[in-house]
């Protein structure tokens, strides 16, 4: 299936040009999306091109500037947040990145009623997290690992927690491992729907081993970065959840929410918190051995001033074939009765589907079914449930938005997006206003992305929010590669692949092949999305064929494929890449003497193992920031898929699945190993150990480190990285410079 046909006609060929590496590094062909910042059922805010903050009313068609670019510029603001009562705006400046989601910033409060910044009781700096209450203009913020509350922006703060300590106790913000591997947020505090209560997590990292690495900087002596980072099998953070009444917080103080007994009996994690009403909250917990999850619904008992979590409101989710959930355990979406909820989990056939839970999980009513997966529940209203799935035309790498009418019986299902712009748009996400009165659809491809606004009742398109016209025009004289998404059937396994082909691809010719791999559990690389990136350039200008393959362990095709890698990472992911390469060779247009593989992070691990597989298939390959042993990676992630590195659990496979154990097998391939020295995520230690093993085995290899760079290798390092990798591949494939 040709998803992005080349627009080359013979008459135009001489005016067309190939992509250059410079195009990619400069972001010449990047696209824009439009996500409305909803502030009511029919209003949203958006930052205009000239940086004014504009309020749009869909129903009146009117718009007005609520905050001028002049005000933004006066404090160098890069972000903003309007208080729900619309009286104040916080302005964020001095952004300073920490880890993947976390950053610190300076915050200024602007009073819209008098057009002045709030003076007196200003916020301290830098702040780790700040947010408005959902109603009114209370502020909660985290400063130096403690939580503070302001009843009004001009009021003095009330300190809620006092035990916060750098790298020891984290209140209202996650520690490293919870941020990266569990919550995927920079915050760990949650307002109740009307702002009566504030829930927060406390993470105690006192006993966690610390990863230490040098940050070279410009000084005479390097700094040492210390991060409490639990590797597989190590001591984990101790988490507690508290709730405080924000009306009179000094009276009762923070109240701890009890952990379900079956969870508290051994090491456990807190996985998410969902407010249902102001006096009902839902917490999700997970055993350290991550195949048992408990959803606990707790109620505020006014007479006792406490949170009660009855056993009758505990719902257990257990996996017998793998770990609980997909990448994370799904979160519930509560219905209007404030007790029943919708949740995605595996059905009896092993496909993740929406279920309706009214009393017990055992009595759950299955809402969607089929040999495809429901992926996200966007919104539940009184009569509709909006969700995304990959059902349409049986392509797992697509995302369409569906509406199920839950107000009628039997419920009827409608695909909202399937036929809107069928060739251009097959991968959608959505953003809903209050009560789903309106919604925005953001299409990511395979054609040029487009964002549109729709009526939540009729699904009618109201207007185009962003169609990337400039990008479309810029691409008119570019020879883009062709893209195909197809599948291979091998030994009862379906391997979906995306192939990126040179513009003048000719099946009778032979092309060098580059496999781009990620392959991590519950990931998906073969997606119907638009991208003009490095591999687009390699196909367009350098005439390579690039393939991405989703093998065992990848997501959205059922539990059989997903959980195949459970407790044995590094085996089937590699096998399936190799199997696919063999199939590609059989297609007749691959030069089997010029095959390479590359990957980043988990992909670096897989590419390293593929190169060291001893198949003789690969001439060369690149591993960027690879994991080299699962004993070196984070407990939460690693143990989810591998269990514990103990003799009585899975130590043997931990040892067998290292890159170092295969050092000898790198002798007959060209290997380029790349890592940032300040990688907080996949520590430089991983590559250091690969290098040591290769040296000890007297195996030649190439390497590049990026001083003071993290897992993302950003900024100028990006340019250097892709230039360096391009040279390496061109040399490997004997392509002239």
């Amino acid at each position: 299936i040709v998803l992005r046909p080349s627009r080359v006609h013979n008459s135009e060929e001489n005016t067309m040009r190939a992509l250059t590496l410079k195009d990619i590094l400069n972001g010449t062909f990047s696209y824009k999306t439009f996500f409305p910042n909803w502030i009511s059922g029919q209003e949203y805010l958006h930052q205009s091109a000239d940086n004014n903050i504009v309020l749009y009313n869909i129903e009146t068609g009117q718009s007005y500037t609520i905050l001028s670019n002049r005000t933004m510029k006066s404090v160098n603001a890069s972000n903003y947040g309007l208080s729900p009562d619309r009286q104040f705006v916080y302005l964020e400046s001095d952004y300073s990145k920490l880890w993947r989601y976390s950053y610190t910033a300076t915050y200024y409060i602007y009073d819209l009623s008098n057009g002045e910044f709030v003076r007196g009781n200003e916020l301290p700096r830098p702040i780790q997290y700040l947010c408005w209450s959902p109603v009114g203009s209370k502020l909660a913020y985290v400063y130096q690992n403690n939580i503070y509350l302001k009843q009004r922006p001009g009021d003095p703060p009330f300190q809620i927690t006092f035990n916060g300590r750098e790298n020891k106790i984290f209140n209202g913000i996650p520690d490293w491992v919870y941020e990266e591997e569990m919550l995927a947020t920079k915050y760990a505090l949650w307002w109740s729907p009307n702002g009566k209560f504030l829930a927060y997590a406390e993470f105690n990292d006192t006993d966690i081993p610390v990863i230490a690495y040098s940050y070279y900087g410009d000084e005479q002596y390097p700094r040492t970065i210390n991060i409490p980072y639990p590797k597989a099998g190590a001591k984990n953070p101790v988490v507690r959840i508290f709730i405080i009444d924000t009306t009179y917080p000094a009276y009762v103080g923070p109240q701890e929410v009890p952990v379900p007994a079956m969870i508290a009996s051994s090491d456990y994690y807190f996985s998410w918190l969902t407010w249902v009403t102001d006096e009902r909250v839902c917490l999700q917990w997970l055993k350290r051995v991550q195949n048992v999850s408990v959803l606990s619904i707790c109620d505020f008992r006014e007479d006792w001033q406490t949170w009660d979590c009855p056993k009758t409101q505990e719902h257990i989710e257990e996996s017998r074939t793998g770990w609980a959930g997909g990448f994370f355990v799904s979160t519930p979406v509560f219905s209007y009765d404030a007790i029943s909820y919708y949740k995605i989990f595996s059905d009896k056939d092993g496909y993740k589907h929406i279920h309706y839970i009214k009393d017990t999980v055992e009595n759950a009513i299955q809402i969607t079914s089929g040999k495809w997966e429901a992926i996200n529940i966007f919104r539940v209203t009184q009569d509709s449930l909006f969700y995304s799935s990959n059902e349409f035309e049986e392509y797992p790498g697509r995302r369409n938005i569906y509406r199920i009418s839950i107000g009628s019986y039997p419920p009827s299902k409608k695909c909202v997006t399937c036929h809107l712009r069928k060739e251009r748009c097959q991968y959608y996400t959505a953003s809903f206003s209050d009560y789903a009165k309106y919604y925005a659809l953001v299409c990511y491809g395979p054609g040029i992305p487009i964002s549109t606004l729709h009526d939540g009742r009729t699904d009618q398109e109201i207007k185009i929010l962003e169609e990337n016209k400039e990008l479309e025009n810029a691409l008119k004289n570019i020879q883009l590669p062709k893209e195909e998404i197809k599948k291979l059937e091998v030994d009862e396994i379906t391997l979906w692949y995306k192939m990126i082909l040179p513009p003048q691809f000719d099946r009778s010719k032979k092309y060098p092949l580059l496999i781009q791999v990620y392959g991590g559990p519950c990931s998906q690389s073969v997606r119907s999305v638009f991208a003009v990136n490095w591999i687009s350039y390699l196909a367009s200008k350098e005439g390579m064929v690039i393939a991405l393959v989703d093998g065992r362990g990848t997501a959205f095709q059922g539990d059989k494929l997903l959980y195949a890698v459970y407790r044995k990472l590094g085996v089937y992911e590699v096998e399936d890449q190799i199997t696919a390469v063999r199939k590609f060779i059989e297609m007749g247009f691959i030069d089997e003497k010029r095959i390479a593989i590359w990957g980043w992070s988990y992909g670096g691990y897989v590419s390293s193992l593929a190169l060291a597989s001893g198949t003789g298939l690969f001439k060369c390959g690149i591993a960027v920031a690879p994991v080299s042993s699962w004993e070196y990676y984070a407990s939460v992630y690693t143990e989810r898929f591998m269990g514990l590195p103990t003799k009585d659990d899975n130590l043997e496979h931990y040892k067998n699945s290292t890159v170092m154990a295969r050092a000898e097998y790198f002798r007959n391939v060209d290997y380029l190993l790349i890592h940032g020295t300040a990688d907080d995520n996949v520590h430089f230690q991983n590559s250091a150990q690969i290098a040591k093993a290769l040296v000890n085995a007297q195996v030649d290899f190439q390497a590049m480190w990026y001083s003071d760079q993290n897992h993302g290798l950003s900024g100028l390092s990006t340019n250097h990285l892709y230039t360096h990798m391009t040279h390496f591949l061109k040399q490997c494939f004997s392509l002239s410079d």
């Epitope: 300190q159 508290f242 009276y251 109240q255 701890e256 001033q305």
Partner: antibody, heavy 117, light 108 residues
Framework: EVQLLESGGGLVQPGGSLRLSCAAS????????MSWVRQAPGKGLEWVSA????????YYADSVKGRFTISRDNSKNTLYLQMNSLRAEDTAVYYC??????????WGQGTLVTVSS | EIVLTQSPGTLSLSPGERATLSCRAS???????LAWYQQKPGQAPRLLIY???SRATGIPDRFSGSGSGTDFTLTISRLEPEDFAVYYC?????????FGQGTKVEIK
């Protein structure tokens, strides 16, 4: 009906120790933060210490930090104040009060601590 | 710490009269964290007002509180014989919580 009953006061020499107790009834003791507030003879009220619902959270006035220890036994519905290294200026009526940092909505009748040689 | 200064130190009034007691904070206090107490000789303090203006359970409506920032007021609209006592304001905004030195309302 909420009741707080302090005990354990008395005469003690400077440098000595005393342990005050406060027996609570009429409410779910384990769900509330509790405090000790004292009043020197003929003087005003001074907050001494508080303990949160979770026993790990304790707070002290600078004047008693390192000498006094607040604790609670939820199974016995009792609040304690262990007072060591007592000084003459610790002489006061000690009240047990329901609440964290305020408001304190219920108070005990108080127990007199006299530090004198 | 926040210092609360009450004035006047003593207020001499007759039953039936209006009493206005002032409490000034050394730094801003959010109204949620200000309370007033009444104490009679030989007795424990009793909570009258919390959140600067909310009456505690069982407190007659002749007692009212107001104010914000650094200035707070307790008003007794018509003094009853049982109202003659010492009144304290208290803040819970910052640790340590602090009390004013008290205002004594005595019979004239």
């Amino acid at each position: 009906e909420v009741q707080l009953l302090e005990s354990g006061g008395g005469l003690v020499q400077p440098g000595g120790s005393l342990r005050l107790s406060c027996a609570a009834s009429g409410f779910t003791f384990s769900s509330y933060a509790m405090s000790w507030v004292r009043q020197a003879p003929g003087k005003g009220l001074e907050w001494v210490s508080a303990i949160g619902v979770s026993t790990g959270s304790t707070y002290y006035a600078d004047s008693v930090k390192g000498r006094f220890t607040i604790s609670r036994d939820n199974s016995k519905n009792t609040l304690y104040l262990q007072m060591n290294s007592l000084r003459a200026e610790d002489t006061a009526v000690y009240y047990c009060a329901k609440g964290w940092l305020g408001p304190f909505d219920y108070w005990g009748q108080g127990t007199l601590v006299t530090v004198s040689s | 710490e926040i210092v609360l200064t009450q004035s006047p130190g003593t207020l001499s009034l007759s039953p039936g009269e209006r009493a206005t007691l002032s409490c000034r904070a050394s730094q801003s206090v959010s109204s949620s964290y200000l309370a007033w107490y009444q104490q009679k000789p030989g007795q424990a303090p009793r909570l009258l007002i919390y959140g600067a203006s909310s009456r505690a359970t069982g407190i007659p409506d002749r007692f009212s509180g107001s104010g914000s920032g650094t200035d707070f007021t307790l008003t007794i609209s018509r003094l009853e014989p049982e109202d003659f006592a010492v009144y304290y304001c208290q803040q819970g905004q910052l640790i340590p919580p602090t009390f004013g030195q008290g205002t004594k309302v005595e019979i004239k």
